[in-house]
Interface confidence: low
């Protein structure tokens, strides 16, 4: 193993950890022969887990299936067989378990029904799966039931006949509110957006669909767009890609008022074989990927202004495969403004890039300390870290997990990677950053599954192996020191780690199966780390940490998007519980403005290595294809616009004469009443 010491060794004194963990390890053997297992957490901090096991035998004419349903209310330590609550019915795994939002306690399971039935069947629970009610549906569902984020009693579903069905009483009664529906989504305030086909079918009418909205669950409707190819919601933005009049290209239009008014996004149009993709969106802005023409496998990332209209080029040659639809774009949720993705270079090698300022600037990931550059590096002393994400996983490289970060584990990022000039196909190692991606260190040798517990107080890992395993590794100091714990004397074929979403739990469940000559038996081991972190953390266990600090001498050190944040973080040497109620303590302070806090407004751009915005020469004296709210519009600008989410105050204010940009609206999208409005310039 590359000369490294045996991985079963560890460091860091945690007295009697073996005895403490042995007393807190709970095994559950599932008494069935199922081929697959799915697991869902019900609610937050409830400890309730539902496990659905399915066993399917394909017969000549039909397939015979059997499901079993198990429930735990102690974070997986014990399970009870509750299959009788669903009348021993076979549950369709492709619909999964539809768990209600927040702590509603609602669960919907979709059952398999015989061929001639009038409609589908669901089992509904609103008490965290203690009881289920069987309900026969007046339609056959095509998709999983979708809960309204605002009211978990409101559900929508599409039928196999493309009907849009709505329930106002948690699936007890259903009403078909529209036919010929292709795609439906909940928006804010219980609004439903959906596209309909007018002539033939969803596929045939692609680019000729209509976008509709209902704000009262189907009593009244408004057509908010025509010639639609597709639509999406991101943050406070509603996006639609709309076919152009003259050719087969399409453009993105944006609305921030639920589709009442639309503006054409200043993004390149795309042809039939290309696509747009919303990579990330929040209340302030959006990252948009625009595919390159041809089957290149890459495109360009653009970042928007606060209106979602004006876009700045953020990153060229952004890897996004057309075939599998894979991109490595990752929001590092443990530090504001940080994103990691991959680019495809001219020689077809893939390289990782990171931004710390929400797409303003991208750079390579710093080489981990004490690491050697691999065979991909031209210069053996200068190289960078490259992160494996979705694309590597799709290519069946030895990467069991995508990068991991948690908002309440400040600064921690864990990912598989390699050190060189590009991503390597060699077996990766696991790397960790404790400062949001500025610096990295090798955490574990070889591929692992990993998860964060107790808001970063514990990191757990299991080696990725095709052999049965019985060792779990854990660290109480953000991945520096690792202890190994043998959780069972009988190794299991490992299938997954499960911990409660949100990384606040101290329990981890190790799932797998034992296999004899003809039978496979599912088993879970739940390890509770509460006795390892045996005391609650106190004030002295935390230390202050300035995020994004790169130059402590500079008064602007730590300033990102106009403000800096100081966090209280657990000391690495403190072995204590953050606890379930832990709230990240942060102290923001506003920074003075500089040109870096502004993006260039429409009609302006920043020349390479310059900080000032200058007027785009090709736009001088031209009519501009720009459509703001679809009205005749005179747009005034001084060429600068504050970056979305930027909170800087004082300092530099880019003052220059305000120009009148006469715009010509050439979009024929918009609402029928507003179409083709023009202004002469």
């Amino acid at each position: 193993r590359r000369g490294a010491p045996a991985e079963d060794q560890d460091c860091g004194r945690l007295p009697d950890f073996i005895a403490k963990l042995t007393n807190n390890t709970h095994q559950h053997v599932f008494d069935d022969l199922s081929g697959s297992v799915s697991l869902s957490w019900v609610g937050d901090s409830t400890g309730v887990i539902l496990v659905l096991t399915t066993f399917q035998v394909p017969l000549v004419i039909v397939s015979f299936g059997q499901s079993k349903l198990y429930r735990s209310e102690d974070y997986g330590k014990n399970f009870k067989d509750i299959t009788n609550l669903i009348n021993n019915t076979f549950i369709r795994t492709e619909f999964g378990m539809a768990i209600g939002p927040e702590n509603s306690g609602k669960v919907i399971l979709t059952a398999e029904v015989s061929g001639g039935s009038r409609g589908g069947r669901v089992f509904r629970s609103s008490d965290f799966a203690k009881n289920f009610v069987q309900t026969d549906l007046p339609f056959h569902p095509l998709t999983q039931m979708m809960y309204s984020p605002q009211n978990s009693d409101y559900l929508l579903a599409l039928s196999t006949e493309n009907g849009l069905w709505v329930s106002k009483n948690f699936g007890e009664k259903w009403e078909e509110i529209h036919k010929a529906v292709c795609l439906a989504k909940w928006g804010p305030n219980n609004i439903i957006f959906f596209t309909t086909h007018v002539n033939g079918s969803c596929k045939a009418d692609l680019g000729a669909l209509e976008l509709w909205r209902t704000s009262d669950l189907g009593k009244t409707f408004k057509t908010i767009g025509v010639k639609i190819y597709s639509f999406g919601l991101g943050g406070r933005f509603l996006f639609a890609s709309v076919m152009a009049d003259k050719d087969t290209t399409r453009r993105i239009h944006v609305s921030t008022d639920q589709g009442d008014t639309w503006s054409m996004a200043q993004l390149p149009s795309v042809g039939q074989e290309q696509f747009y993709s919303i990579l990330a969106a929040n209340e302030d802005m959006v990252f948009m990927h625009v595919d390159e023409p041809g089957d290149t496998g890459f495109g360009t990332i653009f970042t928007s202004d606060d209106r979602g209209i004006v876009y700045s080029k953020s990153l060229d040659r952004h890897l996004y495969t057309t075939t599998g639809g894979e991109t490595d774009f990752t929001n590092v949720t443990s530090l504001r403004g940080v994103y990691i993705t991959s680019t495809l270079s001219e020689d077809n090698s893939i390289q990782s890039m990171i931004t710390f300022d929400q797409g303003g600037r991208w750079e390579h990931l710093r080489k981990p300390e004490n690491s050697k550059c691999d065979a991909t590096a031209k210069n053996k002393n200068e190289c960078s870290l490259h992160i494996h994400a979705s694309y590597s996983i799709s290519q069946k490289l030895n990467v069991p997990m995508a990068p991991l970060s948690e908002p309440n584990a400040v600064g921690i990022v864990i990912a598989h990677g390699s050190v060189g000039d590009a991503i390597s196909v060699m077996v990766p190692d696991v790397y960790i950053s404790d400062d949001g991606g500025y610096s990295w260190a090798k955490m574990l040798e070889g591929p692992h599954y990993y998860t964060i517990l107790d808001s970063g107080g514990i990191i757990v890992a299991i080696e990725h192996s095709n052999r049965p395993i019985n060792v779990i590794k854990f660290s109480t100091d953000e991945g520096q020191c690792w202890q190994s714990y043998v959780f069972t004397q009988e190794p299991i074929y490992f299938t997954g780690l499960a911990s409660e979403p949100g990384a606040r739990s101290m329990n981890i469940s190790i799932w797998g199966f034992t296999e004899s000559f003809i039978t496979r038996q599912w088993v879970s081991y739940t390890v509770d780390f509460k006795d390892i972190l045996e005391r609650n953390c106190e004030e002295d266990d935390y230390t202050t940490w300035l995020a994004h600090s790169t130059d402590p001498g500079d008064y602007k050190d730590g300033c990102i998007l106009g403000y800096k944040e100081q966090f209280l973080r657990l000391r690495k040497s403190s072995v204590c519980q953050n606890g379930r109620d832990y709230v990240v303590a942060k102290q923001p302070s506003v920074c003075p403005c500089s040109l870096e806090d502004f993006l260039c407004d429409f009609g302006y751009f920043r020349p390479e290595n310059a900080s000032e915005c200058v007027e785009q020469p090709e736009l001088k004296g031209h009519e501009l294809e720009f459509c703001l709210y679809g009205k005749e519009e005179h747009l005034t600008t001084n060429g600068y616009r504050k970056i979305p989410g930027d909170k800087c105050q004082g300092g530099m204010n880019p003052a220059r004469e305000v120009k009148d940009l006469k715009k010509k609206c050439t979009s024929n999208f918009l609402n029928p009443t507003k179409q083709n409005s023009k202004s002469n310039s």
């Epitope: 490294a4 010491p5 045996a6 991985e7 079963d8 060794q9 560890d10 460091c11 860091g12 004194r13 007295p15 009697d16 950890f17 073996i18 005895a19 004490n370 190692d429 696991v430 790397y431 960790i432 260190a441 090798k442 955490m443 574990l444 040798e445 060792v471 590794k473 100091d477 991945g479 520096q480 020191c481 690792w482 190994s484 043998v486 690495k572 040497s573």
Partner: antibody, heavy 129, light 107 residues
Amino acid sequence: QVQLVQSGAEVKKPGASVKVSCKASGYTFTSQYMSWVRQAPGQGLEWMGIINPYGGSTSYAQKFQGRVTMTRDTSTSTVYMELSSLRSEDTAVYYCARDPSGIAAAGPASRYYYGMDVWGQGTTVTVSS
Amino acid sequence: EIVMTQSPATLSVSPGERATLSCRASQSVSSNLAWYQQKPGQAPRLLIYGASTRATGIPARFSGSGSGTEFTLTISSLQSEDFAVYYCQQARLGPWTFGGGTKVEIK
């Protein structure tokens, strides 16, 4: 109190094997690693390897790979070190030492190496024809 | 493997004087370093771990410093019982390795 008691002195012929025992008391035997270190007459200390008494897993120095075997008996809280194919240069005092930190899996250095904090009294092994 | 080099091999010091012992690693061992004292006919005794932390029961006249590749053990005022051989040991990467030792003798 915490102590490690080793077996008595041994005289062996070249080519033979020797098995030294180290009995631990005063702490939870399976919770701490155990290293073996030897010292030839008038020479310095040489680390031979380490054993995890809980799982029984081991890691040996390359020099001793294939000749050394470290085992443990949890029922008696004893670790054993067996060295085979003895040669005259194996004449040394052999120590077991509790090593609470074990070996870092990889990557970021442990900020907490605790050292070998408890040592056995040593076992003299003489290899002579 | 990481090679640990101690200097000087022998240090002659009068009682009450200060003794400074050096240990250099062939590559960074971070702070994964320990110091031991060994007297003739006895097993080694742990003095310092983590490069700078005194082990339980070790007098305050012993102090350790350094990280990475350069380390120092300082005995601020030598007592008669301090004349012995001192070894440094790294635990950054397996195999653990010891320095050749520094013998502190009475001047």
